[in-house]
């Protein structure tokens, strides 16, 4: 639901996210199989939507930022992963400006997906009123594709 | 402790809707997620689906569209409703909790066995 | 769907005898060096009783008679010794991927 860029953008998009690698060659002590992905995307993906939607009639007219680029899969395993990692600080950053009840149970349940001792990037937000809440509504809009991509991804294995 | 509890009737008529309930004390549905699975005479498992502590479902494909969970938190209380049940549906039913993430399915019901037969 | 095999169907033991069941899965049931696959014990007019998750780990309250074992596709539940009260059939169940599984199951008994 890329509304301001077109399939070519958001096809570089997945590509340039598939390139985005682990920070650690280290496998974390426990990580969930895909079942549990899957549980977790289901969960995430009704928040997304929904907090993605309330944005779009709150703030009409926001266009999407160019200058934003959510890497938000990893390439280490087949079907492709949340990069939890490197989403988690975009919400934290987003959190005091949107809906704070829904963001957390999206870092909640992003928490849960995320590399143990993965370090995490500080994000900040623009200072600018009408760039940040073009910063706000890019997130929110790449984080909804990524969700459908892994889920189509997760869908269309062996199950 | 966790306790869960499968109620229902024990004997349905073949193209009928077989509903059963399972009532869980000790824990909160609205936290983890919620299973049902059935043991066939012949003492084969078969997983049937959830119902997320959000309420989110998954259903076994294997069922196709016949089959669906709902839930009442009020009553803490999760369903099971199979539609169009033939005697290949005669099966011990049970109810069972999966807490947590990569763990298992650590309580379970007693069971409640049903037979669909004319 | 991963499909799991076990064998024997049916064992019969000795008391105080070691007693080994295999489960092998279609396809590998394993992330980052986790096997998502669990043992239940299942008796009579009983519901299954976990006993082991994630391959190796002793579920609290099980007497350490019990052990698994395995990795990826090949997987071994060991009872060691086996005492009268250990008669049920066993099941191997994995939840790596949608939809759970569970194995055919191998009834124990007493020689």
């Known amino acids: 639901m890329l509304s301001h860029t077109g399939p070519s953008r958001f096809a570089l998009f997945l590509l340039c996210s598939m390139e985005t690698l682990l920070s650690s060659h280290m496998a974390p002590t426990h990580q969930l199989p895909p079942s549990d992905v899957r549980k977790i995307i289901l969960e995430l993906q009704p928040l997304s939507r929904g907090l993605l939607e309330d944005y779009q009639k709150k703030e009409t007219g926001v266009p999407e930022s160019n200058r934003t680029l959510l890497l938000c899969l990893t390439s280490d395993s087949q079907p492709p992963r949340l990069n939890s990692s490197a989403i988690l600080p975009y919400f934290r950053a987003i959190r005091p400006l949107s809906d704070k009840n829904i963001i957390d149970k999206i870092i909640e349940q992003l928490d849960k997906l995320k590399f143990q001792h993965e370090p995490e990037t500080e994000i900040s937000v623009p200072a600018d009123t009408f760039e940040c809440k073009s910063f706000i509504l890019t997130i929110l809009q790449q984080f909804s594709a990524c969700l459908e991509s892994v889920f189509k991804s997760l869908n269309s294995g062996p199950q | 402790e966790v306790q869960l509890q499968e109620s229902g009737p024990s004997l349905v008529k073949p193209s009928q809707t077989l509903s059963l309930t399972c009532s869980v004390t000790?824990?909160?549905?609205?936290?983890?997620?919620w299973n049902w699975i059935r043991k066939f005479p012949g003492n084969e498992l078969e997983y049937m689906g959830y119902?997320?502590?959000?309420?989110?479902?998954y259903y076994n494909p294997s069922l196709k569209s016949r089959f669906s969970i709902t839930r009442d938190t009020s009553k803490n209380q999760y369903y099971l409703q199979l539609n169009s049940v033939t005697t290949e549906d005669t099966a011990t039913y049970y109810c069972a909790r999966y807490g947590n993430y990569g763990y298992a399915m650590d309580y379970w019901g007693q069971g409640t066995s049903v037979t669909v037969s004319s | 769907d991963i499909v799991l095999t076990q064998s024997p169907a049916s064992l019969a033991v000795s008391l105080g005898q070691r007693a080994t069941i295999s489960c092998r899965a279609s396809e590998s049931v394993d992330t980052y060096g986790n096997s998502f696959m669990h043992w239940y014990q299942q008796k009579p007019g009983q519901p299954p009783k976990l006993l082991i998750y994630?391959?190796?780990n002793l579920e609290s309250g099980i007497p350490a008679r019990f052990s698994g074992s395995g990795s990826r596709t090949d997987f071994t539940l060991t009872i060691n010794p086996v005492e009268a009260d250990d008669i049920a059939t066993y099941y191997c169940q994995q939840s790596y991927e949608d939809p759970w599984t569970f194995g055919g199951g191998t009834k124990l008994e007493i020689k």
């Open positions: 994630r391959a190796s």
């Open positions: 119902i997320s502590y959000s309420g989110i479902t």
């Open positions: 000790g824990d909160s549905i609205t936290s983890g997620y």
